[in-house]
């Protein structure tokens, strides 16, 4: 009976359902444009199932094609605010290992106060994703306004 | 050999492929900021496989992590209209049960006429998702401009 | 009993993990608003696993519900450029077979220089998706700024 049951099932972990949804922890010091993320049920609705955080940056643990998504909202912002400040741009990329460094996703805020996008991309075990916010305005830490996540889609 | 093969297999129904894509039905009466949704093949390309509609709001039937996505376009809108009627904001959240009430996703239109975003979030059986549009502008009912959906991703 | 059990099971490879992520190749001649896409590991991080390209347009090979996503960034653009050249609109739709022609996703740029969205939609084997960019501004070919993809989600 136990044997028959086992036949119907596939170990969940072997499906490669790696997934993470992160909330903003803090921004970096002056010369560091990276956003630093945090996740875990104690923090609210953020979580990591497979990927890990390494000093606030997301590290991939399983090879595959991933859906990467992000939303960032500027904290002090109106349609005029965005145009009166230095251009604000968000880029998501692989920042380590250095040999695989590449920008995956890039958006500018222009007249808007929120950017949101998503894309499919191959990622490998050990890839660390960084989210660089260049500009002079601070992002909102509200968990429904700024978040970043990945979802394993297929090998 | 048969055993090894069987181990690679998974019952289709246990995959938990709950998914829904909805189109706008109507907005609420004056004091009700909620958007009311509809879905089903008779209506076009909208559908519900698992989740259900409860008085125009989406109710979840299976626990898990979901990808929630939305696009809303304002109906009679230009960048000047949008900024003149600012702030128009869209929020997606769990509105019932009350004990689980929380905002999951929030965006303002600022100078734009369309917002679109997505996020991963844990949802539980019985959670009802509401989409609140605050402001004086009306959303477009065109099915390629305004839509709302969820996709079960993993347990 | 064993036979009944087997009927409930599905080989992992038949899960229908069709997926594609494309980068912009070129725009069409003057009267053709379509964007022409390309994909493959030799080009960078774009790929096709299942779907195929037919003269730069994406053709579906497996019936199912798909997550369709797109980001398009205008090449030489500021908020003033975007509003001066308004309206620039992007529409993603089924363009063949003609009997199934429909717009799935539509966004205008207004004051912004990037649009990004996603939606769930049923697609059938043989459906060809076209992405029409109407307006006088050209899209960026940077692979982190303009991309288009689909992901099979369920039967």
């Amino acid at each position: 009976q136990r044997f028959a049951q086992a036949q119907q099932q596939l170990p969940l972990e072997s499906l490669g359902w790696d997934v993470a949804e992160l909330q903003l922890n803090h921004t970096g010091p002056q010369q560091d444009p990276r956003l630093y993320w945090q996740g875990g049920p104690a923090l609210g609705r953020s979580f990591l199932h497979g990927p890990e955080l390494d000093k606030g940056q997301l590290r991939i643990h399983r090879d595959g094609i991933y859906m990467v998504h992000i939303q960032v909202t500027l904290a002090i912002c109106s349609s005029t605010t965005a145009s009166r400040h230095h251009p604000t741009t968000l880029a998501v990329g692989i920042c380590s290992p250095a040999s695989r460094s590449i920008s995956l996703l890039r958006l500018s805020f222009h007249q808007g106060c929120t950017i949101a996008s998503q894309r499919l991309t191959p990622l490998a075990r050990g890839d660390t994703l960084c989210t660089n916010l260049t500009g002079t305005l601070l992002p909102s830490r509200n968990t429904d306004e700024t978040f970043f996540g990945v979802q394993w889609v297929r090998p | 050999q048969r055993f090894a093969q069987a181990q690679q297999q998974l019952p289709l129904e246990s995959l938990g492929w709950d998914v829904a894509e909805l189109q706008l039905n109507h907005t609420g009466p004056q004091q009700d900021p909620r958007l009311y949704w509809q879905g089903g093949p008779a209506l076009g390309r909208s559908f519900l496989h698992g989740p259900e509609l409860d008085k125009g709001q989406l109710r979840i039937h299976r626990d898990g992590i979901y990808m929630v996505h939305i696009q809303v376009t304002l109906a009679i809108c230009s960048s000047t209209t949008a900024s003149r009627h600012h702030p128009t904001t869209l929020a997606v959240g769990i509105c019932s049960p009350a004990s689980r009430s929380i905002s999951l996703l929030r965006l303002s239109f600022h100078q734009g006429c369309t917002i679109a975003s997505q996020r991963l979030t844990p949802l539980a059986r019985g959670d009802t998702l509401c989409t609140n549009l605050t402001g004086t502008l009306l959303p477009s009912r065109n099915t390629d401009e305004t839509f709302f959906g969820v996709q079960w991703v993993r347990p | 009993q064993r036979f009944a059990q087997a009927q409930q099971q599905l080989p992992l490879e038949s899960l229908g993990w069709d997926v594609a992520e494309l980068q912009l190749n070129h725009t069409g001649p003057q009267q053709d608003p379509r964007l022409y896409w390309q994909g493959g590991p030799a080009l960078g991080r774009s790929f096709l696993h299942g779907p195929e390209l037919d003269k730069g347009q994406l053709r579906i090979h497996r019936d199912g519900i798909y997550m369709v996503h797109i980001q398009v960034t205008l090449a030489i653009c500021s908020s003033t450029t975007a509003s001066r050249h308004h309206p620039t609109t992007l529409a993603v739709g089924i363009c063949s077979p003609a009997s199934r022609s429909i717009s799935l996703l539509r966004l205008s740029f207004h004051q912004g220089c990037t649009i990004a969205s996603q939606r769930l939609t049923p697609l059938a084997r043989g459906d060809t998706l076209c992405t029409n960019l109407t307006g006088t501004l050209l899209p960026s070919r940077n692979t982190d700024e303009t991309f288009f993809g689909v992901q099979w989600v369920r039967p």
């Epitope: 002090i76 400040h85 230095h86 002079t136 305005l137 601070l138 | - | -």
Partner: antibody, heavy 118, light 107 residues
Framework: QVQLQESGPGLVQPSETLSLTCTVS????????WSWIRQPPGKGLEWIGN???????IYNPSLKSRVTISVDTSKDQFSLKLTSVSAADTAVYYC????????????WGQGTLVAVSL | DIQMTQSPSTLSASVGDRVTITCRAS??????LAWYQQKPGKAPKVLIY???NLESGVPSRFSGSGSGTEFTLTISSLQPDDFATYYC?????????FGQGTKLEIK
């Protein structure tokens, strides 16, 4: 309406540390950048440095070795410490708000005069 | 550091006059320049941001122009309330700097 109020001693001994606090009222200290700017009597304006609610700081290179700016979000306050002061540090010190880390300054305190003297 | 040089240092004018103050940057600062007005014993008040944008609540007789290294503040018709000291400020680099000031006095 946001209001900023500087507080601290009006007289500091040479070689001692100048300490000032700015209290923000009528708005949150979160998300903005908070600067100190000084103006010696009869002279022009000199930017000292700024801080945000997370404690990230940027300092004027010419003063960097002597300056520390800190923030206490729970009290809606930020502070300035300037070590090893001399008569050249005598000035009206203003606490100021800006929306961005590189920005025009939209709200100013009324300023407090600090004299460095024996 | 980027040096900001204002001219003239002092300007005498009468009510109703059109006056122009110039600010030069030691290197290009694009349009990242602000103008302030300061009255004796008071804190400065921002008039113009991003070279030519009028701050909310500032009278329309004030205007700014320029980009790169050369900027001007113009008061189209001087009012009695406008006699004060004016400062330019660059915020193109992380160490923002001010001009030395232009004192506008009654002729």
């Amino acid at each position: 309406q946001v209001q900023l109020q500087e507080s601290g001693p009006g007289l500091v001994q040479p070689s001692e540390t100048l300490s000032l606090t700015c209290t923000v009222s009528g708005g949150s200290i979160s998300y903005y950048y908070w600067s100190w700017i000084r103006q010696p009597p009869g002279k022009g304006l000199e930017w000292i440095g700024n801080i945000n609610y997370m404690g990230n700081t940027i300092y004027n290179p010419s003063l960097k070795s002597r300056v520390t700016i800190s923030v206490d979000t729970s009290k809606d306050q930020f502070s300035l410490k300037l070590t090893s002061v001399s008569a050249a540090d005598t000035a009206v010190y203003y606490c100021v708000r800006a929306e961005g880390s590189l920005d025009a300054f939209d709200f100013w305190g009324q300023g407090t005069l600090v004299a460095v003297s024996l | 550091d980027i040096q900001m040089t204002q001219s003239p240092s002092t300007l005498s004018a009468s009510v109703g006059d059109r006056v122009t103050i110039t600010c030069r940057a030691s290197q290009s600062i694009s349009s990242w320049l602000a103008w302030y007005q300061q009255k004796p014993g008071k804190a400065p008040k921002v008039l113009i941001y991003k070279a030519s944008n009028l701050e909310s609540g500032v009278p329309s007789r004030f205007s700014g122009s320029g980009s790169g290294t050369e900027f001007t503040l113009t008061i189209s018709s001087l009012q009695p309330d406008d006699f004060a000291t004016y400062y330019c400020q660059q915020y193109n680099s992380y160490s923002c700097t001010f001009g030395q000031g232009t004192k506008l006095e009654i002729k």
